[in-house]
Interface confidence: low
Amino acid sequence: VLHYVVCFPALTEGYVGALHENRHGSAVQIRRRKASGDPYWAYSGAYGPEHWVTSSVSCGGRHQSPIDILDQYARVGEEYQELQLDGFDNESSNKTWMKNTGKTVAILLKDDYFVSGAGLPGRFKAEKVEFHWGHSNGSAGSEHSINGRRFPVEMQIFFYNPDDFDSFQTAISENRIIGAMAIFFQVSPRDNSALDPIIHGLKGVVHHEKETFLDPFVLRDLLPASLGSYYRYTGSLTTPPCSEIVEWIVFRRPVPISYHQLEAFYSIFTTEQQDHVKSVEYLRNNFRPQQRLHDRVVSKSAVRDSWNHDMTDFLENPLGTEASKVCSSPPIHMKVQPLNQTALQVSWSQPETIYHPPIMNYMISYSWTKNEDEKEKTFTKDSDKDLKATISHVSPDSLYLFRVQAVCRNDMRSDFSQTMLFQANTTRIFQGTRIVKTGVPTASPASSADMAPISSGSSTWTSSGIPFSFVSMATGMGPSSSGSQATVASVVTSTLLAGLGFGGGGISSFPSTVWPTRLPTAASASKQAARPVLATTEALASPGPDGDSSPTKDGEGTEEGEKDEKSESEDGEREHEEDGEKDSEKKEKSGVTHAAEERNQTEPSPTPSSPNRTAEGGHQTIPGHEQDHTAVPTDQTGGRRDAGPGLDPDMVTSTQVPPTATEEQYAGSDPKRPEMPSKKPMSRGDRFSEDSRFITVNPAEKNTSGMISRPAPGRME
């Protein structure tokens, strides 16, 4: 695990005043902040929002932001007329840049954008844009809300009065009035092409401290179509120092964004500070809990007719403003079994909990590499058919990944099932050893801006030399990345794969739009037929409480991978709970309930929960059923079938579906999901075929951040 050994005090990087005008001076500014002792803060844990007040006294003030805006109590303010925007319709210059501050992603505006009206005391100049988002699948991520309803993303544009101050930073440091606009983003079925430059930029700042210039964009296009309906109140910065100097303009109508585009936000990484160790985490749920209104009055604009237009689509219609939720827990009992030397069968069971029935069908995605070329196919299987699919033309020298997702009404999706990695025909097995690195990582060329660091959050890769050919990786690919295209292949790192018999350098993380981007090819493979292996769900224990991680700075180096957001202790308790919203977003330990029954079974004996499994080397028979005849693969380029591994064309009858993320907006709130039984350790007696290799990647609980999990005390070492 790669540790940053931090020799200076733990200090913040990313509060609202942290971005400065000279791009090339940003490192100097960061050093200056560290030297000046600006307090470290975070969105959870020991440095979370309830602790901000200890180092930033204003955070305990009575006029704090964000707030929930209750429309019925908002007074129409006659002084709040049309906003006057100047420069917003111009394309941004090529000097406009984006930065991952570790707390948000910020756009530093280099052009002149001015706003006046709306009761602002003067003509204000836009300085920067910041974003706040949730954890996955359109979950609530906005800071403000209207009538208790939150949105997947909130964009905030900050302004200062250039007539009074020479810079935004000066206005803040002198505690003088600044302006801020809050714009909600809501999921819709199509990509919003106005956001393309922003989404593209996000892919270039995946890692903390990364900066990138942005393609030209029109700032007006990032605002709601109707600017006439807005709320006004006086509040604060939503991050330390929480200065109560902000005149907020909160727009009523949201801006559309697709799930596909949302994934770019969910793919951003940060570094979290634990004592003197920094670990790489996903930057998610970067919103401050809502604050009390106290004696403040929220006003609403008096722009004529602006509040009459389609009021139902926002204030009265829950469809519009509820954060989109997953429709079920993940499909469970994932199994991949060889049928013969050239065919595999994937099977699964329906989700245990369906929040928004019915399940219409299942999407099965599988990907592989062959001759350094990666491919991926996605196909559907109707829910009333057998929950299994046959993949033919399996190549012995390819690594395969499989995962399944349920599709409900309105194309709403479940969490992803555990992902299974399979490679046939090899006698090499992985002998895991605890990998610990200290110090700053050695940089080596990154393959793309999308490369992600390995991090196990608060867990350590380990297996202490116990040979196994079946590894569970708790990557948080359940609810916390549900609906995403994030791939589990990105957690199969060069270090891990070296032990698995793979050569080659680092694996780039998989961009959220493609699953996968790159997998290593096998270094050597024998020509024996693959034998069935038990599809266990958790080969190793859950993460322990320590903060080990293995980042490679800026995605450089040979170890990249995916992990989940926040650390979590063994018993599943969070270090810190922000508010009720996060409570309701707690995830179950997906996909472990029934599969746990199988863990201590030895192959090849059939187990009660998998009655159709055959002895080693044999074909699997499915009593009373034909083989799957309804699955159609598609590839990422539009469904072209190629000669590579795939479903037998003779078996195919249904229509092709693109393997894209859901881009629809859904009704319904998120019921509190029940906690599922704890994961059991794999006993030493578990045996696996050494001629076939599976690695399962489980949907971990939201805050379980890890790859190959570190065994807790009493677990397998």
């Epitope: 809501q186 819709s188 199509r190 092409s193 709601p224 179509a225």
Partner: antibody, heavy 116, light 111 residues
């Protein structure tokens, strides 16, 4: 806020024709605009849309037969090679900026007749 | 291709309630909207997202959806409600997005 289509006329088959939708009261930089047609005595048929950034989407049957473009205040529909089946009233409609699949503002329509 | 099916014509007595249906194989996975079109006029949006009504549309018009059928219900039908009614939905996503209209239902108000 209003829309008005123009350019509809009698054309011979194969002669390209461009219809124009002129908008007032709102900005095309904030809305997607769609074209829908209706043959005499028939139902509505969605042709395609152009979104606020200029990206275009077409019905499967309309790809290659129609081209949608826009300026700051107008949206054009070009019928590349009209056939007699393209005889219809063509409506331009504004798509709700939030709910993509609903058109909340329509023009009165313009009639195109394709005949030899 | 994706097809929305509507009855060609429906009759209702003045003051009565009538339901117009729209079906498709996978409509349960999509949202429907409804439009009213009177002769010689442009369509008017009545319902979007299955059940939501734009401002200005009388509450006599309501939408619902069950299974693969979306329904527009007009309660207390009036002579002015005589028109063609179209359902619509979106099909596909991303670059393959398109909108689809049903064939329309001609509503006749008698009495």
């Amino acid at each position: 806020q209003s829309l008005e289509e123009s350019g509809g006329r009698l054309v011979t088959p194969g002669t390209p024709l461009t219809l124009t939708c002129t908008v007032s009261g709102f900005s095309l930089s904030s809305y997607a605009m769609g074209w829908v047609r209706q043959a005499p005595g028939k139902g509505l048929e969605w042709i395609g849309i152009i979104d606020s950034r200029g990206s275009t989407y077409y019905a499967t049957w309309a790809k290659g037969r129609f081209t949608i473009s826009k300026t700051s205040t107008t949206v054009d529909l070009k019928i590349t090679s009209p056939t007699t089946e393209d005889t219809a009233t063509y409506f331009c409609a504004r798509e709700d900026s939030y709910y993509y699949d609903s058109f909340n503002l329509w023009g009165p329509g313009t009639l195109v007749t394709v005949s030899s | 291709s994706f097809v929305l099916t509507q009855p060609a014509s429906v009759q209702v007595n003045l003051g009565q309630t009538v339901s117009l249906t729209c079906t498709a194989d996978t409509l349960s996975r999509r949202y429907a909207s409804w439009y009213q079109q009177k002769p010689g006029q442009a369509p008017v949006l009545l319902i979007y997202r299955d059940t939501s009504r734009p401002s200005g549309v009388p509450d006599r018009f309501s939408g619902s959806s069950s299974g693969n059928t979306a329904t527009l219900t007009i309660s207390g039908a009036q002579a002015g409600d005589e028109a063609d009614y179209y359902c619509a939905t979106s099909d596909g996503s991303g670059s393959s997005y398109q909108c689809v209209f049903g064939g329309g239902t001609q509503l006749t108000v008698t009495g």
